[in-house]
Amino acid sequence: MMTGTIETTGNISAEKGGSIILQCHLSSTTAQVTQVNWEQQDQLLAICNADLGWHISPSFKDRVAPGPGLGLTLQSLTVNDTGEYFCIYHTYPDGTYTGRIFLEVLESSVAEHGARFQIP
């Protein structure tokens, strides 16, 4: 029986060009965590495996950093990074737990001010 729950950072926002930490925490279970997957829509971003440690998907190596802990750090954010992110915990004997985070990447305040106020 699956008794665990996943707590996430929920809906978060960050500025374009900045970085953000995606965090999930599995609680209320003694299940062994075999692996944690991080996904954006249908794309696998990274894996943290109990035996092997971290593996970052080649297409995200430049902008994704492992940690802290089982979390994931996204760097050099673009507006295209806006969307749903999922942490998938593979555990035994429970099975799989999924957490959802929605990230909104906003135009930086500098860019907004630059667009609004013209220097004569």
């Epitope: 075999t34 696998l44 495996n49 429970d94 099975g95």
Partner: antibody, heavy 119, light 107 residues
Framework: EVQLLESGGGLVQPGGSLRLSCAAS????????MSWVRQAPGKGLEWVST????????YYPDSVKGRFTISRDNSKNTLYLQMNSLRAEDTAVYYC????????????WGQGTTVTVSS | DIQMTQSPSSLSASVGDRVTITCRAS??????LNWYQQKPGKAVKLLLY???RLHSGVPSRFSGSGSGTDYTLTISSLQPEDFATYFC?????????FGGGTKVEIK
């Protein structure tokens, strides 16, 4: 090309033991979670055991727990299944399988080796 | 344990037909549903995982859909090499369990 080649099957009496082997090639064996799945004659598939990439953790269903032991030798690219206290209901074709790195599914299967438990 | 019920258990179809196989789980499996193909004397092949993700090398005529407890495998235009037995498998909760299989035969 990924290849999984099982061996060690045969006829054994109830209460007996057997050790299955699976020789893996065509991929970095030590990076992958591996499993055994079986199929009784004319029946469906049943997951039998799983071992993590480094061999740290092993998982079993209740039907074989305490009787079967999965292990691996990453230096030999080989997966094993030690089967003790065999019963008639363990009669099946046993498949060696590799899991996707994401652990969502078993992406490669061997051809299988047949285990018959009968007196 | 989660029971996986596949239907139909067998079907007859012709080349070019659209074929649909369904798999029902006894409880919500959150899209952790895979489809495999088995042919006599051949290794089992993974077709789709996580409900709808096509495994590498699998033709696009295979597709998957569903959510909750109900899932579907569709072959849009049946080819001669598709005559085989198809199994679903849930990867949500241990022990991971399989459906009973659907044998697709030539009409």
């Amino acid at each position: 090309e990924v290849q999984l080649l099982e061996s060690g099957g045969g006829l054994v009496q109830p209460g007996g033991s057997l050790r299955l082997s699976c020789a893996a090639s065509g991929f970095t064996f030590s990076n992958y979670v591996m499993s055994w799945v079986r199929q009784a004659p004319g029946k469906g598939l049943e997951w039998v055991s799983t071992i993590t990439s480094g061999g740290t953790y092993t998982y079993y269903p209740d039907s074989v727990k305490g009787r079967f032991t999965i292990s691996r030798d990453n230096s030999k690219n080989t997966l094993y299944l030690q089967m003790n206290s065999l019963r008639a209901e363990d009669t099946a074709v046993y498949y060696c399988t590799r899991w996707l790195l994401s652990l969502y599914a078993m992406d490669y299967w061997g051809q299988g080796t047949t285990v018959t438990v009968s007196s | 344990d989660i029971q996986m019920t596949q239907s139909p258990s067998s079907l007859s179809a012709s080349v070019g037909d659209r074929v649909t196989i369904t798999c029902r789980a006894s409880q919500d499996i959150s899209n952790f549903l895979n489809w495999y193909q088995q042919k006599p004397g051949k290794a089992v092949k993974l077709l789709l995982y996580y409900t709808s993700r096509l495994h590498s090398g699998v033709p696009s005529r295979f597709s998957g859909s569903g959510s909750g407890t109900d899932y579907t495998l569709t072959i849009s235009s049946l080819q001669p090499e598709d005559f085989a037995t198809y199994f679903c498998q849930q990867g949500k909760t241990y022990p991971y369990t399989f459906g009973g299989g659907t044998k697709v035969e030539i009409k």
